[in-house]
C-alpha cells in the first residue's frame, strides 16, 4: 500500500476534487437550512458572524464547524448534557489503552480538545490523552498533567457476524478506506492498514503530531464517529445509519474493541501492576491449597480417619466463646 514520494496518480485527483466540493456544499447546506450535517448534537440559529447560521454544541455551547467532524471532547460533553496462515492480526502493545472508564463529562479547551487534566464532582482527578482516555492513576486536585499526550496510533478491533464465506480482503480493505475517506473525511494516509482474519477485522489509524496539518480530521475523532456508527448511534444529522457493504454483502459488526496508543506510554503506578500480580499469586496459592486439600481428604478417606478428625475439629470449635 505504501507509495514513494511524488505526485498522486491522476485517478486520485477526481475523488479529491469531489471531496472538496462535498465539503463546500456541506457548508452551504448548513447555511441554507441552518442545520449541522456532521453533528446532530447541536442547536443552530441564524445569529453567527455576519448573520450567518451558527451551530453550537449542546453542553458546552461552543460554536462548531459543520463542514468537518466535531471533536470527541465536545461530543462527549454534549452526550452527557443531552436529554445515552501467517498471523496478520496486530497484537496490541502492553502500553495500549482501552477506554474502560466509560462516559464522563469532560473539560474541553477553547479549541474543543480534551484538557490534559480531568476531574469529577468529588475532586478526583486524572490525566487523559488526546482521545480523552485515562492514562494515569486517579489522584486529587494536586495531580499535575503537564501536557496533553497525543494518541498517535488507534487499533479498531471488529468481529463481524457469521457470513456464508469470508470477505475478500482487498475488497474489505478498499471499502473501509473509502468509508473513512468519504464519511469521516479522514485523509487516506492516516489509515495505515486493514487486517482481516475471519471473523476479525482490524483497522489501524496512525497520525503523529508532525503529520497532522491544520484542517486534517483527527484520528481520535474519526474513530469515535465510527464507533458510534457501528453501535447504531450515528452522530450525523439526518443521515441513515451506517450501511457497510462489501461487494453488496452486508458487513454486520457484533463486537468492537478500540485500543489507543500514545506517543508517550501511560504512567500507571506499580500499585496497579502489584494488584494484578497479587491477584495472580492469590489464585495460584488458592489453587495449590485446594489441590493439597483434595489430596489430604482423599488420603484420609482411604485410611478412614477423616470423619474422626472432622468431629474433633467441630468439637473444638464449639468450645470457642460465642461473640
Amino acid at each position: 500500500m505504501a507509495r514513494g514520494p511524488g505526485l498522486a496518480p491522476p485517478p486520485l485527483r477526481l475523488p479529491l476534487l469531489l471531496l472538496v466540493l462535498a465539503a463546500v456544499t456541506g457548508h452551504t447546506a448548513a447555511q441554507d437550512n441552518c442545520t449541522c450535517p456532521t453533528n446532530k448534537m447541536t442547536v443552530c440559529s441564524p445569529d453567527g458572524p455576519g448573520g450567518r447560521c451558527q451551530c453550537r454544541a449542546l453542553g458546552s455551547g461552543m460554536a462548531v464547524d459543520c463542514s468537518t467532524l466535531t471533536s470527541k471532547c465536545l461530543l462527549l460533553k454534549a452526550r452527557m448534557s443531552a436529554p445515552k496462515n501467517a498471523r496478520t492480526l496486530v497484537r496490541p502493545s502492553e502500553h495500549a489503552l482501552v477506554d474502560n472508564d466509560g462516559l464522563y463529562d469532560p473539560d474541553c479547551d477553547p479549541e474543543g480538545r480534551f484538557k490534559a487534566r480531568q476531574c469529577n464532582q468529588t475532586s478526583v482527578c486524572w490525566c487523559v490523552n488526546s482521545v480523552g482516555v485515562r492514562r494515569t492513576d486517579k489522584g486529587d486536585l494536586s495531580l499535575r498533567c503537564d501536557e496533553l499526550v497525543r494518541t498517535h496510533h488507534i487499533l479498531i478491533d471488529l468481529r463481524h457476524r457469521p457470513t456464508a464465506g469470508a470477505f475478500n480482503h482487498s475488497d474489505l480493505d478498499a471499502e473501509l478506506r473509502r468509508l473513512f475517506r468519504e464519511r469521516y473525511r479522514l485523509h487516506p494516509k492516516f489509515v495505515a492498514a486493514v487486517h482481516y482474519e475471519q471473523p476479525t477485522i482490524q483497522i489501524e489509524l496512525r497520525q503523529n503530531t508532525s503529520q497532522k496539518a491544520a484542517g486534517d480530521v483527527d484520528i481520535g475523532d474519526a474513530a469515535y464517529y465510527f464507533e458510534r456508527d457501528i453501535k447504531g448511534e450515528s452522530l450525523f444529522q439526518g443521515r441513515g445509519g451506517l450501511d457497510l457493504r462489501v461487494r453488496g454483502e452486508p458487513l454486520q459488526v457484533e463486537r468492537t474493541l478500540i485500543y489507543y496508543l500514545d506517543e508517550i506510554p501511560p504512567k500507571f503506578s506499580m500499585k496497579r501492576l502489584t494488584a494484578g500480580l497479587i491477584a495472580v499469586i492469590v489464585v495460584v496459592v488458592v489453587a495449590l491449597v485446594a489441590g493439597m486439600a483434595v489430596l489430604v481428604i482423599t488420603n484420609r478417606r482411604k485410611s478412614g480417619k477423616y470423619k474422626k478428625v472432622e468431629i474433633k475439629e467441630l468439637g473444638e470449635l464449639r468450645k470457642e466463646p460465642s461473640l
Epitope: V43, S45, D47, Q54, S60, P110
Partner: antibody, heavy 115, light 107 residues
C-alpha cells in the same frame, strides 16, 4: 419589528415563587435562543441561563441552577422564568434577550421581594 | 467559566474626544465578544457584535476591534448622549459572561 414584552414589576413575599414572562413577536420564536439576565440595583449584568424554544434545550449558570427554571410556550411565543424560594437577594431587574448576540432586549421586570 | 475584565471602571472625557474601552478575556474566545451600552434606567443596547461588526441604527462613531483575548470598543467623538455604562459580553461558550462594566462620564 422584533419585540420582547415583559411586565414592569412584580412584588412577592420571601420564600414564595414567581413566574416571569417574556412575550416575543416579530420573528420566528423557535429559531433563536432566549436568554435571561439579572441586574441588581447599581450592579452589573449577570447571565442566568438560556432556552432554545425549538427543542426546549436549557443551560444555566451554576449559581442559578437551584433558583431558576426556564420554559417556553411556543403556541403563544412566550418564554418564562420560574424563580423559587425567593429572598431579598433575588430583588433585581430581570431581562429577557434574544439570540447569542443579545440583539433585542425586553424592558425588564423589576422583582421586589419584601414582606 | 470565561472571565471578562473591563478597564478602567470609570472613564471621564470631554465632548468630542476619542475614547476606548478595554475588555480582556481569560482565554482565547476568537471574536465572540459583543458590546452593550446601558443608559440610566434603560435596557442594555447592542452596539457591536462579534468584536467588530456594526449594528444597524447605531451611530458610526462606535467601532470595535480585537480577537483572541484583547478587545476594544472605541467612540471616536464622544457626545453627551453617550453617558452610560458599557459592558462587554462573551458568547464563546456557556455560561455566557459579562464584564463588570465601565462607566463613561463627561467632564
Amino acid at each position: 419589528q422584533v419585540q420582547l414584552q415583559q411586565p414592569g414589576s412584580e412584588l412577592v413575599r420571601p420564600g414564595a415563587s414567581v413566574k416571569l414572562s417574556c412575550k416575543a413577536s416579530g420573528y420566528t420564536f423557535t429559531s433563536y435562543w432566549m436568554h435571561w439576565v439579572k441586574q441588581r440595583h447599581g450592579q452589573g449584568l449577570e447571565w442566568i441561563g438560556n432556552i432554545y424554544p425549538g427543542g426546549g434545550y436549557t443551560n444555566y449558570d451554576e449559581k442559578f441552577k437551584s433558583k431558576g427554571t426556564l420554559t417556553v410556550d411556543t403556541s403563544s411565543s412566550t418564554a418564562y422564568m420560574h424563580l423559587s424560594s425567593l429572598t431579598s437577594e433575588d430583588s433585581a431587574v430581570y431581562y429577557c434577550t434574544r439570540s447569542s448576540v443579545f440583539d433585542y432586549w425586553g424592558q425588564g421586570t423589576t422583582l421586589t421581594v419584601s414582606s | 467559566d470565561i472571565l471578562l475584565t473591563q478597564s478602567p471602571a470609570i472613564l471621564s472625557v470631554s465632548p468630542g474626544e476619542r475614547v476606548s474601552f478595554s475588555c480582556r478575556a481569560s482565554q482565547n474566545i476568537g471574536t465572540s465578544i459583543h458590546w452593550f451600552q446601558q443608559r440610566t434606567n434603560g435596557s442594555p443596547r447592542l452596539l457591536i457584535k462579534y468584536a467588530s461588526e456594526s449594528i444597524s441604527g447605531i451611530p458610526s462613531r462606535f467601532s470595535g476591534s480585537g480577537s483572541g483575548t484583547d478587545f476594544t470598543l472605541s467612540i471616536n467623538s464622544v457626545e453627551s448622549e453617550d453617558i452610560a455604562d458599557y459592558y462587554c459580553q462573551q458568547s464563546n461558550s456557556w455560561p455566557f459572561t459579562f464584564g463588570s462594566g465601565t462607566k463613561l462620564e463627561i467632564k
